[in-house]
Amino acid sequence: QEDEDGDYEELVLALRSEEDGLAEAPEHGTTATFHRCAKDPWRLPGTYVVVLKEETHLSQSERTARRLQAQAARRGYLTKILHVFHGLLPGFLVKMSGDLLELALKLPHVDYIEEDSSVFAQSIPWNLERITPPRYRADEYQPPDGGSLVEVYLLDTSIQSDHREIEGRVMVTDFENVPEEDGTRFHRQASKCDSHGTHLAGVVSGRDAGVAKGASMRSLRVLNCQGKGTVSGTLIGLEFIRKSQLVQPVGPLVVLLPLAGGYSRVLNAACQRLARAGVVLVTAAGNFRDDACLYSPASAPEVITVGATNAQDQPVTLGTLGTNFGRCVDLFAPGEDIIGASSDCSTCFVSQSGTSQAAAHVAGIAAMMLSAEPELTLAELRQRLIHFSAKDVINEAWFPEDQRVLTPNLVAALPPSTHGAGWQLFCRTVWSAHSGPTRMATAVARCAPDEELLSCSSFSRSGKRRGERMEAQGGKLVCRAHNAFGGEGVYAIARCCLLPQANCSVHTAPPAEASMGTRVHCHQQGHVLTGCSSHWEVEDLGTHKPPVLRPRGQPNQCVGHREASIHASCCHAPGLECKVKEHGIPAPQEQVTVACEEGWTLTGCSALPGTSHVLGAYAVDNTCVVRSRDVSTTGSTSEGAVTAVAICCRSRHLAQASQELQ
């Protein structure tokens, strides 16, 4: 960070005349908001990112910045515009007193303002290196395609690009945006400055210890010699990548962000924009043994967020901390004692640990997948990464109890063949944030733009919930779960699938008057049932049990409690076929599961009956899990009987298309 006092001589004293002719008033009814890092030591007061509304042009951004300077000058404050953003997000970076925030928030076009904050390299010990030779035989790993069609951007420290392991593979761009190192006695030693970035470049594309040996890389320096950077520097780096992409479009791009800071709305927004421009972003979940949703860019939904596991597939412990976890993590990857290029010498290797190393593994796998199938979208790539991961190998006891259900039990792996997965119907489970405990609280889970929401379920640890429903929001279906009075809150769980040319709709049946329960089916020609949801207004559904097995010849039907409205997700897509699979247990049981067989993909997961002792239902890979209250707290055994209902689908169309390609 620039010396707070030292450069005030340089600050532009804006002229009052700048104000003339800039009398655009802020739009009525819209209040700009101020955000800052929740972690106090990471805050950088005095520097602010002013984010303008989406359609703001560069000229308007510049004019708004000048207007701020002019109004500040009238009040006797000096300001300095450090950067004007365009290409990714409209806005500007300004050095000013916090006293001016109120004024800045009232400027025209302003959407929100965020105080700058620190981001950090996510490796431990990233500068206490241990020189070691590679501990494997090079023959063992000869990937079919080394990622040669893909360019991987690395936003990190400086790197020793002529290290034997990566020479010729990494182009060092002229981009550099780093804060001053802390401490007056800091000694800048080149090999230490390059340590983190060199190691990660080696993990991604190193000749002997790299994942994607054919991938070419470009490095941007956003972390200083202590492994520290800023949100604003990272934003400007992401903007640089977007501009480079526009100037010289190349093949698929992967951006590796092996860094983390506190939750940042603006950093997440920039990642979203870049992802929507077709760039794959991979980031470290963070090394704080905490919920990854509290950190950025880990919490950005469009980013592939990677936690770290060790050689035994256990979550990595890093001193007193360890890998982050939770619903914002997409998958885990090796992140302990990872051998890679050491900047201590041109032939040295070192082992480093952390979610940075894990993210570098996934960036390498992504580069190989994209090189084999350059047309893959971000959604398709993410689904493939999940599909080919090792399932259920992580010991979940390491995670806090309330995070276990939310954290994906997936360890990244290379596909057995980088081609030929096209026939598969890919689905993943997306958990919402927790709703909070208020009576009317709801939680919403969303799929990515090019995924289809095929089913929606809900879960509450207390069991006090009012079900869930699929509803349209901004032209897209979302999954909304409802808390109940006295409940501690709910989660919405969306099943998000890749289903090309799909036409899906929701059919709803209101609560039934009759005692037989509520039913709804897919009545449109060619539409099949992909998921069932139920939602009720009453606080307790009671013990009414609808018939568990649906009548023969009516597989396209959702059945539920008579006091609940039932929602059927009905889809039409070429060659799509689905079937209902049920597993009922007569005696009370805390967990009932039912899985789809090989070749079929779980699209829907729900529970019968929807009574209050059922905590909820959710999909884990291809298994539908229904959780009930602790058996000891369940009154009668008759109420304890629970059925897990899975809807399993496959696409004959995708299978045929794949065979035709081969």
């Epitope: 030779p133 034997r164 010729g168």
Partner: antibody, heavy 115, light 109 residues
Framework: QVQLVQSGAEVKKPGASLKVSCKAS????????ISWVRQAPGQGLEWMGW????????NYAQKVQGRVTMTTDTSTSTVYMEVRSLRSDDTAVYYC????????WGQGTTVTVSS | QSALTQPASVSGSPGQSITISCTGT?????????VSWYQQHPGKPPKLMIY???NRPSGVSNRFSGSKSGNTASLTISGLQAEDEADYFC?????????FGGGTKLTVL
């Protein structure tokens, strides 16, 4: 295009010193170091060492350690190799090559050490 | 004594295929993906023909191919042509340096 251009032939007396230059062009210098390789008449290739164009770090072959110094001048994109205390068995063609991968070679500098 | 062992000479007729071997240890050829092959005509600098075991630089004929098994790397030239007559050297990384083979003289009969 990528090019490495070396200095001209040299005749030296035993005990003298030799300094060969290699000027690089056509690529991003910091992405590769420079290797030095020599070839005695009718013999094979011998790797002598490597220097980083990025930070000046060196990696010398054990056989020549202490007698060889490699340096770089980034302002002129030129790398130098100095050999001290020349002996008759230092008679060889000296090549510079790009990086450890040695994908591009200089034209060679013939060095004769003779009394 | 070179660190990597190559046959001193091989020969073949035009159109034939020949293979040159390069044997090292687990500390060089067997331990790294970075085996290279160079062609050298008399009075000329070496030219890179194969890098990282089996990759061909652009501009090198696809008649040249490389492979590796254990501690031995091989260069195969198919459809021999008169201009292939030259010396061929293999090289490999070691933990801290580079080593070359002694060279193989290829004669096209």
């Amino acid at each position: 295009q990528v090019q490495l251009v070396q200095s001209g032939a040299e005749v030296k007396k035993p005990g003298a010193s030799l300094k060969v230059s290699c000027k690089a062009s056509g690529y991003s210098l910091t992405s590769y170091g420079i290797s030095w390789v020599r070839q005695a008449p009718g013999q094979g290739l011998e790797w002598m060492g490597w220097i980083s164009a990025y930070n000046g770090n060196t990696n010398y072959a054990q056989k020549v350690q202490g007698r060889v110094t490699m340096t770089t001048d980034t302002s002129t994109s030129t790398v130098y190799m100095e050999v001290r205390s020349l002996r008759s068995d230092d008679t060889a063609v000296y090549y510079c090559a790009r990086g450890y991968g040695m994908d591009v070679w200089g034209q060679g500098t013939t060095v004769t050490v003779s009394s | 004594q070179s660190a990597l062992t190559q046959p001193a000479s091989v020969s073949g007729s035009p159109g034939q295929s020949i293979t040159i071997s390069c044997t090292g240890t687990s500390s060089d050829v067997g331990g790294y993906n970075s085996v290279s092959w160079y062609q050298q005509h008399p009075g000329k600098p070496p030219k890179l023909m194969i890098y990282e075991v089996s990759n061909r630089p652009s501009g090198v004929s696809n008649r040249f191919s490389g492979s590796k098994s254990g501690n031995t790397a091989s260069l195969t030239i198919s459809g021999l042509q008169a201009e292939d007559e030259a010396d061929y050297f293999c090289s490999s990384y070691t933990s801290t340096s580079m080593v070359f083979g002694g060279g193989t003289k290829l004669t096209v009969l």
